[in-house]
Interface confidence: low
Amino acid sequence: EEELQMIQPEKLLLVAVGESATLNCTVTSLLPVGPVLWFRGVGPGRELIYNQKEGHFPRVTTVSDLTKRNNMDFSIRISSITPADAGTYYCVKFRKGSPENVEFKSGPGTEMALRAKPSAPVVSGPAARATPEHTVSFTCKSHGFSPRDITLKWFKNGNELSDFQTNVDPAGQSVSYSIRSTARVVLAPWDVRSQVTCEVAHVTLQGDPLRGTANLSEAIRVPPTLEVTQQPMRAGNQVNITYQVRNFYPQNLQLTWLENGNVCRTETASTLTENKDGTYNWTSWLLVNTSDQRDDVVLTCQVKHDGQLAVNKSLVLEVSAHQKDQSSDATH
């Protein structure tokens, strides 16, 4: 008769909540005489899971008939697994003794870990917008998964990113785990239509990773480029001043016209032209009547974009000497 070995072939058993778990245990010898019991954990505080001879274990059934004379299979099945069932299970051989049985040999143990899918990744962007060439951070969070091994990748417009940091918590044993990853993305002027994607792969997903996305449009501010032009004189001494605000995002923009420092009109961008890259253009006109102007007119256009400090662009409208004479005549 060979020396007794307690064989628990699975080191790790992954089980989903509600499923049944089969814990395998076979022995290589019928001797010494005595029962095989199942415990969760080790030491004095270990929990009895199954004892064929005594006790009531409604969720536990044996795989084989333990009453059979030459039975060497002591595997058990636990039904309706809950998170509380996680732990390492040992089949333990006891030597029959008096007044009580004495522990003889333990199997190496099977760790039962819950197999739980990660939640859909949630990607959040920065609290405030940033301008191109600045770096912004995106955070991806997923939780509730087990086992702990998980792979997370970041993509921008389908291209894999490398500048990110990932943490899985907790570090030690747990019923389930969560992952948090922060990616750093350098903004480009054309990123209004860009998207970042967080991709999570886990053993429970059977090769079909979960994805969460965020639009860079929520994180970027593209400041406008400003251009002011003066159209040729019209009949009736009118000048058409055109103010072009180009390539800005978001569309929240306010424009104020000042004539010699005095506000003459304020307007909020409404009829915008959208560019291919997602930025906007807007044109504003001001008709200035120069017939009653005695001195040169300083026209200032003040643009306030997305709550930022106003940007000014000025134009000096020169009044001709002839007009100045006429104007001075009129004042006499």
Epitope: Q8, K11, S106, P108, E111, D149, A201
Partner: antibody
Framework: QVQLVQSGAEVKKPGASVKVSCKAS????????FSWVRQAPGQGLEWMGW????????GYAQKFQGRVTMTRDTSTSTVYMELSSLRSEDTAVYYC???????????WGQGTLVTVSS | EIVMTQSPATLSVSPGERATLSCRAS??????LAWYQQKPGQAPRLLIY???TRATGIPARFSGSGSGTEFTLTISSLQSEDFAVYYC?????????FGQGTRLEIK
């Protein structure tokens, strides 16, 4: 940096026993399991068994049952593998390897050549 | 026990080219598969675990895929230091078992 340093080469006669040691440094010894893997000259890798330094639990491949014993000394962070009843086909390089997540081997010792010859 | 079979036994590839190594399990090991590289006179070195996760310090040219019984190790652009013997190992069930190895040699 984790390091596993094994004992030196051994020459043994058939029927004798050999005990190879593996000293771990740079990590928490009791947190990880250790396996022993051997490689006969010009051959592949063969897993022999594992042991848990914390509990002393062991598990051996069926082929080595009854001939192999794995023990540990937690005070020196050393694991041992003893193979008895040596035969010429036991000539191999014996590696100790640290188990990560009780699964794959992330650190390996440099190997110990055991030659069994009469 | 689960038997791991690697193919081909020897693979001849030119530097800069792609190498594809296969590993088959006699029964499903889910994604519990690791790959190792071994050079002459050295201990094996962990490359990939969990089928596709690169170990610390392993270059991105190494990638793993597969699940169940069929697995692949791909080296996208072979460097001179990549010519070695490669082993797969399953850890879904004891005893842990290795494939017999694929020798990657310079063409």
């Amino acid at each position: 940096q984790v390091q596993l340093v094994q004992s030196g080469a051994e020459v043994k006669k058939p029927g004798a026993s050999v005990k190879v040691s593996c000293k771990a440094s740079g990590g928490t010894f009791s947190n990880y399991g250790f396996s022993w893997v051997r490689q006969a000259p010009g051959q592949g890798l063969e897993w022999m068994g594992w042991m848990s330094p914390s509990s002393g639990n062991t598990g051996y491949a069926q082929k080595f049952q009854g001939r192999v014993t794995m023990t540990r000394d937690t005070s020196t962070s050393t694991v041992y593998m003893e193979l008895s009843s040596l035969r010429s086909e036991d000539t191999a390089v014996y590696y100790c390897a640290r188990e990560r997540s009780g699964s794959y081997f992330d650190y390996w010792g440099q190997g110990t050549l055991v030659t069994v010859s009469s | 026990e689960i038997v791991m079979t690697q193919s081909p036994a020897t693979l001849s590839v030119s530097p800069g080219e792609r190498a594809t190594l296969s590993c088959r399990a006699s029964q499903s090991v889910s994604s519990y598969l690791a790959w190792y590289q071994q050079k002459p006179g050295q201990a094996p070195r962990l490359l990939i675990y969990g089928t596709s996760t690169r170990a610390t310090g392993i270059p991105a040219r190494f990638s793993g895929s597969g699940s169940g019984t069929e697995f692949t190790l791909t080296i996208s652009s072979l460097q001179s230091e990549d010519f070695a013997v490669y082993y797969c190992q399953q850890y879904g069930s004891l005893p842990f078992t290795f494939g017999q190895g694929t020798r990657l040699e310079i063409k």
